[in-house]
Interface confidence: low
């Protein structure tokens, strides 16, 4: 017989199956091109001196063999004498150590037994009712398949699963979805309903993130407010990287976790846009305002839990940067302008009250006046800062007010609202003899002293009712007592105290009359 043909003679060894545990198994036969076929098998046991014969019986009952020698794979053409269009039965007989070992038989129609491809190209992954659904386009001319998957996590070996029979242009598989770990999947296919058809190779890895993206474990720090009124938000700790199974390490398409930074500027609520979402890699500059910052992790299945921080407002104040003039028509603030065409946000809130009670006003874009100042005015009727109490004022500026990350702090300071001159008048002025020619004048702290940096000084005025001479004594804003000396006994004096701010002279307290009694010697 020719080696390329199936030999229709008795094989050159006795026909007896030893029934041993070793021997040929897993015979697979399939068409590999339009006119060529291949059969392959496994051999278990010592391979030295083993000869393999591929046996074939036609539907007519005639049988033949191919001698494969020591090889466990054999190719033949459709001209080899084996009927490829009709059903044939194939098995392998291995002659070893003077005995014959037989494989289980496979019965198939060779022409229709095709070597299947694994899923090729894109495998679309989605989540369906808590399970993973994979979908792909059936390879050309390969409709009708049995599909298996195998999957592993970073800490577990491969586990096998079954996708069931498929008979459409699109194939799909439902697989387990892990809550908190990434998985690597591979798929393989074989011809449906064809006994002895062999499995395809495994597909390329499909990398699937956990159902829940990892919670971002990051820490932020905020730098000091710079000269430009901005401070950098920096990431102290990078988000933990998702541990990946072996085949997903490197590029790992599909397991990407994206971290987004969501900024919410709490100050200046009257601005157009309060929140902004950024890539975590792009750490923004912030104004001195208060912010809530959230880091949101998401993967292809959607967002996960977020981590939220509060960044408190920078409370460093500039006591002299703001000028306030109060006129009959209303109040005007002046401060050093930042640049041309700036929008300013002026925010104020009563000191000691919840930050949620802040009020603000947005100016139209304005250029500096000839003195380089920016201004904001309001009328008494508007009620702005109209109550006689201490307000904390912050002014923010931006050339692009619609961009949350481009605001800067111009200044923060305190202001006493309403009629500060009158409201600040010191009360409970009392005079006590100190010595033969001096007295001690005390008063209760002015309301202005509750407003840091607002009270510039107290002035104590002493008037000699005889000579009408007046003397004035400046007193540090932290003091509420002064000693008046050089006084004459028996003379009537009046004393008054006022509290001054940097821009306003206070109103004198009610005159307090006193005199030093004449000491009579015995």
């Amino acid at each position: 017989c020719r080696t390329s043909e199936c030999c229709f003679q008795d094989p050159p060894y006795p026909d007896a199956d030893s029934g041993s545990a070793s021997g040929p198994r897993d015979l697979r036969c399939y068409r590999i091109s339009s006119d060529r076929y291949e059969c392959s098998w496994q051999y278990e046991g010592p391979t030295a001196g083993v000869s393999h014969f591929l046996r074939c019986c036609l539907s007519s009952g005639r049988c033949c063999y191919f001698a494969a020698g020591s090889a466990t794979r054999l190719q033949f053409s459709d001209q080899a004498g084996v009927s490829v269009l009709y059903t044939v039965t194939l098995w392998v007989e291995s002659w070893a150590r003077n005995q014959t070992e037989k494989s289980p038989e496979v019965t198939l129609q060779l022409y229709n037994s095709v070597k299947y491809e694994p899923p090729l190209g894109d495998i679309k992954v989605s989540k369906l009712a808590g399970q993973l659904r994979m979908e792909w386009e059936t390879p050309d001319n390969q409709v009708g398949a049995e599909v298996q998957f195998r999957h592993r996590t970073p800490s577990s070996p491969w586990k096998l699963g079954d996708c069931g029979p498929q008979d459409d242009d699109t194939e799909s598989c439902l697989c387990p979805l892990e809550m908190n770990v990434a998985q690597e999947f591979q798929l393989r296919r074989r011809q449906l309903g064809s006994q002895g058809s062999s499995w395809s190779k495994w597909s390329s890895p499909v990398c699937v993130p956990p159902e829940n993206p990892p919670q971002p474990q990051v820490r932020f720090s905020v730098e000091q407010l710079g000269q430009d009124g901005r401070r950098r938000l920096t990431l102290k700790e990078q988000p933990t990287q998702l541990e990946l199974p072996e085949g997903c390490q490197g590029l790992a398409p599909g397991t990407e976790v994206t971290y987004r930074l969501q900024l919410h500027m709490l100050s200046c609520p009257c601005k157009a846009k309060a929140t902004r979402t950024l890539h975590l890699g792009k750490m923004p500059y912030l104004s001195g305002a208060a912010y809530n910052v959230a880091v949101i992790s998401s993967n292809q299945f959607g967002p996960g839990l977020n981590q939220t921080w509060h960044i408190p407002a920078d409370t460093h104040t500039e006591p002299v940067a703001l000028n306030i003039s109060v006129g009959t028509n209303g109040t005007t603030m002046y401060w050093p302008a930042r640049a041309q065409s700036m929008t300013y946000c002026i925010e104020w809130q009563p000191v000691g009250q919840d930050g949620g009670l802040a009020t603000c006003s947005l100016t139209a874009p304005q250029d500096p006046d000839p003195a380089g100042m920016a201004t904001y005015s309001w009328s008494r009727e508007s009620g702005a800062m109209g109550q006689e109490k201490c307000y904390y004022i912050t002014i923010f500026a931006s050339a692009h007010p619609e961009k949350l990350t481009l605001w800067s702090t111009v200044l923060s300071t305190y202001h006493f609202g309403g009629n500060a001159s009158a409201a600040g008048t010191p009360h409970h002025v009392s005079v006590k003899n100190h010595s033969l020619d001096s007295v001690s004048v005390d008063w209760a702290p002015s309301l202005l002293s509750t407003c840091p940096g607002v009270l510039k000084e107290y002035v104590v005025r002493c008037r000699d009712e005889d000579s009408k001479q007046v003397s004035e004594h400046p007193v540090q804003p932290t003091e509420t007592q002064v000693t008046l000396s050089g006084l004459r006994a028996g003379v009537a004096y009046t004393v008054q105290v006022r509290a001054d701010t940097a821009w306003l002279r206070g109103v004198w307290s009610q005159p307090q009359r006193f005199s030093i009694e004449v000491q009579v010697s015995d």
Partner: antibody, heavy 118, light 109 residues
């Protein structure tokens, strides 16, 4: 291989409509968005709109709202773009493009020249 | 809706490094895509995502981004790199997309 093949050049009168086709092959048609982008002679690229071939949902640039319609036929893996009430400034090369996960256009059609002239 | 701003023209000496920039509000939230277009041809994607190059794009092309600016860098520019370069990004306000006006790159010498 992955490709988008567009229909041929068109000459139209002002006020008329034009329909340009874009046939996709070499990938899972329903898995990726298709966009339409145009380029007037000597000008830059201008995004017109997007269609999701899976469900057919669309979103159009403000400028083309009311004049553009994008449709798809999953049986032939073809996307269509129809622009109505044509004016001379609609003279341009019209491209279809497939976008990847990053909304970047990784595959482009060869372009269809549409000339609007009276 | 967002706008992306590019320099209209940039030139570079053969073999030198050139940086083309794209500025816009949406780039604070989304990465840019970069496209090369030669006369009479459809655009070709050269960079997308953080700094991803499609297969077939030489590694002299790279991308980077900062606050609201994306950059395309060509290290060792070649004569065949002379072309128009466009950036694009998702609009920060909706799922629409927007292109920059384009930069004409001239390679000298």
């Amino acid at each position: 291989q992955v490709q988008l093949v567009q229909s041929g050049a068109e000459v139209k009168k002002p006020g008329a409509s034009v329909r340009v086709s874009c046939k996709a092959s070499g990938y899972t048609f329903t898995s990726y968005y298709i966009h339409w982008v145009r380029q007037a002679p000597g000008q830059g690229l201008e995004w017109m709109g997007i269609i999701n071939p899976s469900g057919g949902s669309t979103s159009y640039a403000q400028k083309f709202q009311g004049r553009v319609t994008m449709t798809r036929d999953t049986s032939t893996t073809t996307v269509y773009m129809e622009l109505s009430s044509l004016r001379s400034e609609d003279t341009a090369v019209y491209y279809c493009a497939k976008s990847n996960w990053a909304y970047a256009f990784d595959i482009w059609g060869q372009g269809t020249m549409v000339t609007v002239s009276s | 809706s967002s706008e992306l701003t590019q320099d209209p023209a940039v030139s570079v000496a053969l073999g030198q490094t050139v940086r083309i920039t794209c500025q816009g509000d949406s780039l604070s939230s989304y990465y840019a895509g970069w496209y090369q277009q030669k006369p009479g041809q459809a655009p070709v994607l050269v960079i997308y995502g953080k700094n991803n190059r499609p297969s077939g794009i030489p590694d002299r092309f790279s991308g980077s981004s900062s606050e609201d600016t994306a950059s395309l860098t060509i290290t060792g520019a070649q004569a065949e790199d002379e072309a128009d370069y466009y950036c694009n990004s998702r609009d920060s306000s909706d799922n629409h997309l927007v292109f920059g006006g384009g930069t004409k790159l001239t390679v000298l010498g």
